[in-house]
């Protein structure tokens, strides 16, 4: 049965830059090991953000990723990503990969528009 | 430029043995996942297997499930496929292809290698 | 497994002429995982169309995917000489990523 991914449609980030959003597949499968890939779109370019792996005991994820991380549970991921500035704002897409065991089974959110809006820099106090 | 080439194909007799190899260039082989697709004479498509880039997760269409391993040596950009106890059915050109790097289409394909499989 | 069925199995057509190819799943599969490739005798496969109605790279615009859920359209808008060879839809969403049979357009 094919997997449907949700994310919300619009998310705004802090005014430290970051950003927070879960991203749910359905119907939730026995699963050993699924990936979880965030994708930026740009016209019609997609680029990795970032991605990892989530198994039964690895429920923390994207280590190597400095600006992204994220926790498992069941069928949803949290996922926060940080260090953005306004011209980070874009189409944000949560992709569902079902790896092991076999079927494998892919899914894509229709993707989350976050919204960056760049602090005002302190003014100079005499 | 990408360059997929196959190698390996020949006449081999029902129960033999026989491996193919699939030398990639022109991009970065390990960050692709990596197929077999065949082709009966003068039939359709058929997607034999898949091996992600990292090697760890492999699939097979159940008709070649036990007798067909999928290898990849990421150090030599080569893509294997080593074919055991193969049936006059598994006679077809052998592709490798390149799976896109967000899902599994095939965006470049090599010019196959023709396994016939006769007594 | 998903099984894909092409229609027609052989459209016969002029240049210059449209083309509507039909491509219906067995069943639905995610995110309009499906793709259209060409395949002309003694050569490799060419991809066409992915993600249901996004063109390949240097594919022209003449060719055009669309649908979704089980019901995939390929069209080509006018025929060109080189268009006439075999088109094949491929599902992607789940393993086996099975092909359809093909669907032959042939020069009438």
């Known amino acids: 049965e094919a997997i449907q991914v949700t994310q919300p449609s619009v998310v705004l980030a802090s005014s430290h830059g970051v950003a927070s959003f879960p991203c749910e597949y359905s119907p939730s499968h026995n699963t050993d090991e699924v990936r979880v890939t965030v994708l930026r779109q740009t016209n019609d370019q997609m680029t990795e953000v970032c991605a990892t792996t989530f198994t039964e005991k690895n429920t923390v994820g994207f280590l190597d990723y400095p600006f992204c991380s994220g926790t498992f549970n069941e069928s949803r991921v949290n996922l926060t990503i940080q260090g953005l500035r306004a011209v980070d704002t874009g189409l944000y897409l949560c992709k569902v990969e079902l790896m092991y065991p076999p079927p494998y089974f892919v899914g894509m959110g229709n993707g989350t528009q976050i919204y960056v809006i760049d602090p005002e820099p302190c003014p100079d106090s005499d | 430029q990408v360059q997929l080439v196959e190698s390996g194909g020949g006449v081999v007799q029902p129960g033999r043995s026989l491996r193919l190899s699939c030398a990639a260039s022109?991009?970065?082989?390990?960050?692709?996942?990596m197929h077999w697709v065949r082709q009966a004479p003068g039939k359709g498509l058929e997607w034999v297997a898949v091996?992600?880039?990292?090697?760890?997760?492999?699939y097979y269409v159940d008709s070649v499930k036990g007798r067909f391993t999928i290898s990849r040596d990421n150090s030599n950009n080569t893509l294997y496929l080593q074919m055991n106890s193969l049936r006059a059915e598994d006679t077809a050109v052998y592709y490798c292809?390149?799976?896109?790097?967000?899902?599994?289409?095939?965006?470049?394909w090599g010019q196959g290698t023709l396994v016939t499989v006769s007594s | 497994e998903i099984v894909l069925t092409q229609s027609p199995g052989t459209l016969s057509l002029s240049p210059g002429e449209g083309a509507t190819l039909s491509c219906r799943a067995s069943?639905?599969?995610?995110?309009?995982?499906l793709a259209w490739y060409q395949q002309k005798p003694g050569q490799a496969p060419r991809l066409l169309i992915y993600?249901?109605?996004s063109r390949a790279t240097g594919i022209p615009d003449r060719f055009s995917g669309s649908g979704s859920g089980t019901d995939f359209t390929l069209t080509i808008s006018r025929l060109e000489p080189e268009d006439f060879a075999v088109y094949y839809c491929?599902?992607?969403?789940?393993?086996?990523?099975?092909f359809g049979p093909g669907t032959k357009v042939d020069i009438k």
């Open positions: 993600g249901a109605s």
């Open positions: 091996i992600w880039y990292d090697g760890r997760n492999k």
């Open positions: 292809a390149r799976g896109e790097f967000f899902g599994e289409f095939f965006d470049y």
């Open positions: 069943q639905s599969f995610s995110s309009n995982y």
């Open positions: 022109g991009f970065t082989f390990s960050s692709f996942g």
């Open positions: 491929q599902q992607y969403g789940t393993s086996p990523f099975t």
